[in-house]
Interface confidence: medium
């Protein structure tokens, strides 16, 4: 059982310093910005992290959204990352959900965050270049320090 | 800057009912969760409550679940806390807490003291 | 319900001592703790969140560490402001819980 607490706006970096956003095709992308740019890409690099108590203590659940023209939410389903057109809901009766992930921060690295998802155990939100996109995939966990598991996540509030 | 200012407290008896309010200044108070904490004379903290920012979750600490009801006024930025059946060992400092990201009462108010007796 | 056991209660120490409290969750909070500082009469203040990351404008002779169950506060060179009460918070379940606290008394 997942009951959603409160919301934060956040900008949401890998380690290259590279900003997450949602382009006009829906996918959430990796891309050089300056604060300027981050700004003039508003919504699109703005989103918004909805925390939710869990009550099998895991840690702090969270599902990620957007709101362009309508909200949209991160979803894992089939261990493929892509944005639903949906609010994440207040509560959500089940242990897992394709839309919960778990954002923890990685030890030693204060400032580092990471997110496992709560449906696929071992798999985390992660930065994989393809071709010459950077793309927010889902990525099993397979060695300690992997950099494309790691984020950054400033609060906008 | 961003402000809690609790109010409401005094003495009441055992059995008795109060409701204690925080008024919230300095934030986007739709967009945050917050908590009731309490200090009773002389003793440590105690978490007691919290509901979410647009109020359709609450949760309460044993000690008080089905005497105590958060709830909270996004119109008037406003957050109270009805307090029935109270028993002496309610008596403390009462606190309302704004949490940060990652979960740490990062804003707190001063405080306003209940006293249980007869 | 996972319960917190904070040690010790209370210590005595001299300016620039080093001092160590810690806190044991009943079960893992992963590293969903925060410890505060509370002055008499006064609301507590945040010092440390996530286990180990520093809150801002606090001074870095504070440290935390741990995860899982066992946590620990470090003060490394304890000074006269530092006299105070400290309390750890787990947030990692449904319901949030304080250990009993830890008094800081001088010597």
């Known amino acids: 059982y997942f009951g959603k607490l409160e919301s934060k706006l956040s900008i949401i970096r890998n380690l290259n310093d590279q900003v997450l956003f949602i382009d006009q095709g829906n996918r959430p992308l990796f891309e050089d910005m300056t604060d300027s740019d981050c700004r003039d890409n508003a919504p699109r690099t703005i989103f918004i992290i909805n925390m939710y108590k869990d009550s099998q203590p895991r840690g702090m659940a969270v599902a990620i959204s957007v709101k362009c023209e309508k909200i949209s939410t991160l979803s894992c389903e089939n261990r493929i990352i892509s944005f639903k057109e949906m609010n994440p809901p207040d509560n959500i009766k089940d242990t897992k959900s394709d839309i919960i992930f778990f954002q923890r921060s990685v030890p030693g690295h204060d400032n580092k965050m990471q997110f496992e998802s709560s449906s696929y155990e071992g798999y985390f939100l992660a930065c994989e270049k393809e071709r010459d996109l950077y793309k927010l995939i889902l990525k099993k966990k397979d060695e300690l320090g992997d950099r494309s598991i790691m984020f950054t996540v400033q609060n906008e509030d | 800057q961003v402000q809690l200012l609790e109010s409401g407290g005094g003495l009441v008896q055992p059995g008795g009912s109060l409701r204690l309010s925080c008024a919230a200044s300095g934030f986007t108070f739709s967009s945050y969760a917050i908590h009731w904490v309490r200090q009773a004379p002389g003793k440590g903290l105690e978490w007691v409550s919290v509901i979410s920012g647009e109020g359709s979750n609450t949760y309460y600490a044993d000690s008080v679940k089905g005497r105590f009801t958060i709830s909270r006024d996004n119109s008037k930025n406003t957050l109270y806390l009805q307090m029935n059946s109270l028993r002496a060992e309610d008596t403390a400092v009462y606190y309302c807490a704004r949490v940060m990201i990652g979960y740490g009462f990062d804003y707190w108010g001063q405080g306003t003291l209940v006293t249980v007796s007869s | 319900d996972i319960q917190m056991t904070q040690s010790p209660s209370s210590l005595s120490a001299s300016v620039g001592d080093r001092v160590t409290i810690t806190c044991r969750a009943s079960q893992s909070i992963f590293n969903y703790l925060n410890w505060y500082q509370q002055k008499p009469g006064k609301a507590p203040k945040l010092l440390i969140y996530d286990s180990s990351t520093l809150q801002s404008g606090v001074p870095s002779r504070f440290s935390g560490s741990g995860s899982g169950t066992d946590f620990t506060l470090t003060i490394s060179s304890l000074q006269p402001e530092d006299f105070a009460t400290y309390y750890c918070?787990?947030?990692?379940?449904?319901?949030?819980?304080f250990g009993q606290g830890t008094k800081v008394e001088i010597k």
């Open positions: 918070l787990q947030y990692s379940g449904f319901l949030f819980t």
